[in-house]
Interface confidence: low
Amino acid sequence: SWMWNQFFLLEEYTGSDYQYVGKLHSDQDRGDGSLKYILSGDGAGDLFIINENTGDIQATKRLDREEKPVYILRAQAINRRTGRPVEPESEFIIKIHDINDNEPIFTKEVYTATVPEMSDVGTFVVQVTATDADDPTYGNSAKVVYSILQGQPYFSVESETGIIKTALLNMDRENREQYQVVIQAKDMGGQMGGLSGTTTVNITLTDVNDNPPRFPQSTYQFKTPESSPPGTPIGRIKASDADVGENAEIEYSITDGEGLDMFDVITDQETQEGIITVKKLLDFEKKKVYTLKVEASNPYVEPRFLYLGPFKDSATVRIVVEDVDEPPVFEFAEFYETFVCEKAKADQLIQTLHAVDKDDPYSGHQFSFSLAPEAASGSNFTIQDNKDNTAGILTRKNGYNRHEMSTYLLPVVISDNDYPVQSSTGTVTVRVCACDHHGNMQSCHAEALIHPTGLSTGA
């Protein structure tokens, strides 16, 4: 019967002679050279050669366990004289023994990962892994231990798992956003003489809302003409926020001040500016300066950072209303309505007009009155300027026939003495009435109660 032990062969042999594997031997072999040993199977005659007389097997080439860990061969023992086998052909195995000839290799040369800024110490960031081609079942050649070569004190790595975690409290993206961590994987359980590989992990801190908005100045001043219609933008204010994205979004609001109901603030979503706009009609003569308290706040707040203080800031906005030169107008109404008797005489005073100018009278207002040019010629009435900011409407003829013309519309131009001259046109409605002999009105046409502006023929 065959006599042999398991054959083992160390990989990566560097000696100059062939590497001795072992000896095939039959108990029928009397040592007289009558038996011939023959080898067949994986690598026989090429990788493995046999001394046909002694059964000694040698390896002719350097073998790599990671390429092929096991060779299966067959042995025969032949009687040289008869040519017949003295043993049944038998299969045997040459097992290649591992040496530590492979360094750990990471699955990626570069890893990228993100972790929120201000994370608690020990927050999971990323897991790296390295594989070692050596034999994991024998020795520590494939036992990989991870360590951090670059990236402390910010990050740590678990030696067995390759899990990278945060190692420093209050890592602030606004201070530093990018970290390059270098991780080493070393075999032999990290012991001296182990082989190693490294990988780079690019870690980005992602933003959390840990910064409130801040106005760069405590007071802003804008001016706007009193004629600005509602909706007019009069100025922009901008708070800055060190965060990014939705954490840097800002909402503006007016929280206090005399102008609370006179102005609005809207948020420009693109620029994150607050636009102060006119809400109600302004009047320089009533109020010239408004003070507002404007607040900038983050709409999305993380409760865990509220201890840092309120996520809002406020600034004072001073708005100066600018005067616009306004024309004089009738004092008591947009139009005057007056009456004339059918039997009136010429040059009778039927109405006194009063005018006012909203502008501040720096040197006293002086108004002049006249009929509009289109009504002045051939009019049935005249206007008499009293030079005291009043004027009288006078009849120009004897008698009026209310059946011919029941209502007259007089366009009166009132001008001031400013430079440039400002003027407005007011309408005086004159209704013709039947009167008794004392001049008391008895009847007037009702349609005169509603009258258009403009000019009726014959005025």
Partner: antibody, heavy 122, light 106 residues
Framework: EVQLVQSGAEVKKPGASVKVSCKAS????????MHWVRQAPGQGLEWMGW????????EYNQKFQGRVTITADRSTSTAYMELSSLRSEDTAVYFC???????????????WGQGTLVTVSS | DIQMTQSPSSLSASVGDRVTITCKAS??????LAWYQQKPGKAPKLLIY???TLQTGVPSRFSGSGSGSDFTLTISSLQPEDFATYFC????????FGQGTKVEIK
Amino acid sequence: EVQLVQSGAEVKKPGASVKVSCKASGYTFTRNFMHWVRQAPGQGLEWMGWIYPGDGETEYNQKFQGRVTITADRSTSTAYMELSSLRSEDTAVYFCARGVYGGFAGGYFDFWGQGTLVTVSS
Amino acid sequence: DIQMTQSPSSLSASVGDRVTITCKASQNIYKNLAWYQQKPGKAPKLLIYDANTLQTGVPSRFSGSGSGSDFTLTISSLQPEDFATYFCQQYYSGWAFGQGTKVEIK
């Protein structure tokens, strides 16, 4: 070859508990996150939680907090998901899924179990 | 929590068609997005991760693109075995899936 083999279908009454197992092979069990995801009939996928078998750390979806418990037995490379106080809306296929190496917080899922149908009915 | 919105919810297409499915995140998730394919009665299968990296063994007719909050899965030439439901999934903050897009035969 990575394989995740789950336990068979279960029928439970409302108020009862169910424990689904997921046996892993073909990789080092302790070195990957194991996630549980469920899918109600004709519906989308809903993440339930994970366990890191290396140290037993877990994280659960707030929706299931207090009702779900994920455990792992390192000696048999098996992960378990137990859901208690069952109600009819818990009728679903429950999957275990391996979280890959790398990526933020365990990343995406590269291998999935075949799924376990849990029917909750009175 | 981050919400994922997939569109369309279903589509009909023929073999050889180019098919595009979109997925929108409710906030910036950078490139932390995966796409899965699921056939009836089966577990989901990973197609694409990190928004545009093809999983080993997945045919090159599948591709992913996008970053931030808008992502796209494209099948360049639909094959008979591609009729299935497709899900997107974010893994930037927690894990959330889109509601799925069913690709049916026209």
